[in-house]
Interface confidence: low
Amino acid sequence: KSPIFGPEEVNSVEGNSVSITCYYPPTSVNRHTRKYWCRQGARGGCITLISSEGYVSSKYAGRANLTNFPENGTFVVNIAQLSQDDSGRYKCGLGINSRGLSFDVSLEVSQGPGLLNDTKVYTVDLGRTVTINCPFKTENAQKRKSLYKQIGLYPVLVIDSSGYVNPNYTGRIRLDIQGTGQLLFSVVINQLRLSDAGQYLCQAGDDSNSNKKNADLQVLKPEPELVYEDLRGSVTFHCALGPEVANVAKFLCRQSSGENCDVVVNTLGKRAPAFEGRILLNPQDKDGSFSVVITGLRKEDAGRYLCGAHSDGQLQEGSPIQAWQLFVNEESTIPRSPTVVKGVAGGSVAVLCPYNRKESKSIKYWCLWEGAQNGRCPLLVDSEGWVKAQYEGRLSLLEEPGNGTFTVILNQLTSRDAGFYWCLTNGDTLWRTTVEIKIIEGEPNLKVPGNVTAVLGETLKVPCHFPCKFSSYEKYWCKWNNTGCQALPSQDEGPSKAFVNCDENSRLVSLTLNLVTRADEGWYWCGVKQGHFYGETAAVYVAVEERKAAGSRDVSLAKADAAPDEKVLDSGFREIENKAIQDPRLFAEEKAVADTRDQADGSRASVDSGSSEEQGGSSR
């Protein structure tokens, strides 16, 4: 499929001008290659009319130009003094006319309307409101006022001052007679339809002395704005329909066959299943404007989109609308990354997030998509060292492997972690990608004790058991903090006895904390990686308490699950007392509701949110 994109149809009137924008992937080759506009012949050839190399056909001399905008990946063809002879099929393209790097454009130039003298022309957008003003003389002030529409050769009554309303206009038309000082009556038609276009006649009085005024109503279907985005990227549709529909339900729909427009999302809570997890409808402003963000763009997302306002939350005749034609460029600069990542309860996932490598210094973010209230995506972690409180100790955003990819690790998975997550940066807004985390049946591969208590001044050894499937991976221990997980020295203790049917390639790797201090309290992770690519992780919380009895402390897997004060014997470990502590994540909701992104001067900031779920603290 050609990556060149432009308007499929361009309509204009004789004597007017058109401006046609064609989009291309802005690679260095494309930016500098020849751009052309040609007319398709009946036998299939395409005759150049204008090109970026300076050629202009005699047909276009003095009335057309072609301008390349290489930084945007667009070129624009302007054609003036249009005639009906310009109607036809054209191509805008790159390189050689016959090579196929082009887009078909249909240009339709129609005759201007033949209007009666003294005709007032009203040009109004579909779905909007028109006010037709009708002046009259004093002698007709008390006489019947009426508006007719010319249907073929005959005028058909639309509305009159005696109360008649044509059924086609029921509920959307009114006749206003101004105060005695003004010799004027007005007909207001709301929710304009394409079928409302045509010639109207307003009349005051019914005899030969009646006052008449001709009006021509043109109802414009909105020209779609062209939007050119990369596969796997994202698009934002900004929809501003005006304050008169501020309190009416809004929608975004995608045109399918014929006139059907399938709702993508609306403010009544409807959302198409194909967009689950990758769409946000931003709350509307007081003036009724709103925007819709779609991420993880797919080939099948290409097409014509309409946003509008109607109490049903879907397109109806007379809905005010805005239109876009979305082209999804398959020659995408956004690399492929997994759209689904699977993990098991108690296990972990490592998610790779792409970003624009030119923006390596941009701040990286990860957020959890929520479907409620038209979709939102509250932040969970960023590369500045902010982590949402409920995720402390089990979530980390790493700049590795770098060069266009960062990594997010989430462990201690539960079924509540299943859902859609967005990777984004504060740089290029188009690089927003979606990943779905699925929780599947199974056991975590890495085995570590539950929460562990260390004694001040003593030595603590914490085991991590790696099955043989990770024999070729680098194994590590690290201490979690808001900015990542700092690597710690660890010892390979030889094969692990924790796995059935696992040979000598299984491994027990221990973390040793010598002369434990209060600073050693916190979350520790063991994990596997290959170079800068991270695999599974497991987390252990180490609490530190005052010395009770001398000695060092080993922690076994069996004792990890022991009840408080229960004595447990495990081969290879000395008998110790295991003080179970409450998981610190359970305290998260009890922390002060404050965003402690502290400033240099020590001031504190707090957070308000539209959702009580956001009311956990956060740490820096």
Partner: nanobody, 123 residues
Framework: EVQLVESGGGLVQAGDSLRLSCAAS????????MAWFRQAPGKDREFVAA????????YYLDSVKGRFTISRDNAKNTVFLQMNSLKPEDTAVYYC????????????????WGQGTQVTVSS
């Protein structure tokens, strides 16, 4: 490229109100978080308030909470700071900032800054 222009500053008495506006050019406005920072003479620039791109989250400096309200109008590409019950210690140059996805109090997520508007509160 986003450009930010603040307005609405001035000289007021303690206890009075002011409404600051920040007009942004650039159509990506509605996908960015916006924030207000302030800088008093001889002090570091300090965070005042921020609002997320979709207006679902607002952040405030503790000392202004309940007195200041941040809001935005994406259709008009404008962010506002309504300042009530002003105190002499609110005197500073107020800066509008933009360019982060998520509102926050650190200066680093904000790529774009206005020139500032002076607010002086006399006792």
């Amino acid at each position: 490229e986003v450009q930010l222009v603040e307005s609405g500053g001035g000289l007021v008495q303690a206890g009075d109100s002011l409404r600051l506006s920040c007009a942004a050019s650039g159509r990506t406005f509605s996908t960015y978080a916006m924030a207000w920072f302030r800088q008093a003479p001889g002090k570091d620039r300090e965070f005042v308030a921020a609002i997320s791109w979709s207006s679902d989250m607002t952040y405030y400096l503790d000392s202004v909470k309940g007195r200041f309200t941040i809001s935005r109008d994406n259709a008009k590409n404008t962010v506002f700071l309504q300042m009530n019950s002003l105190k002499p210690e609110d005197t500073a140059v107020y800066y509008c900032a933009s360019g982060a996805y998520y509102a926050g109090s650190s200066t680093s997520p904000y790529n774009y800054w206005g020139q500032g508007t002076q607010v002086t509160v006399s006792s």
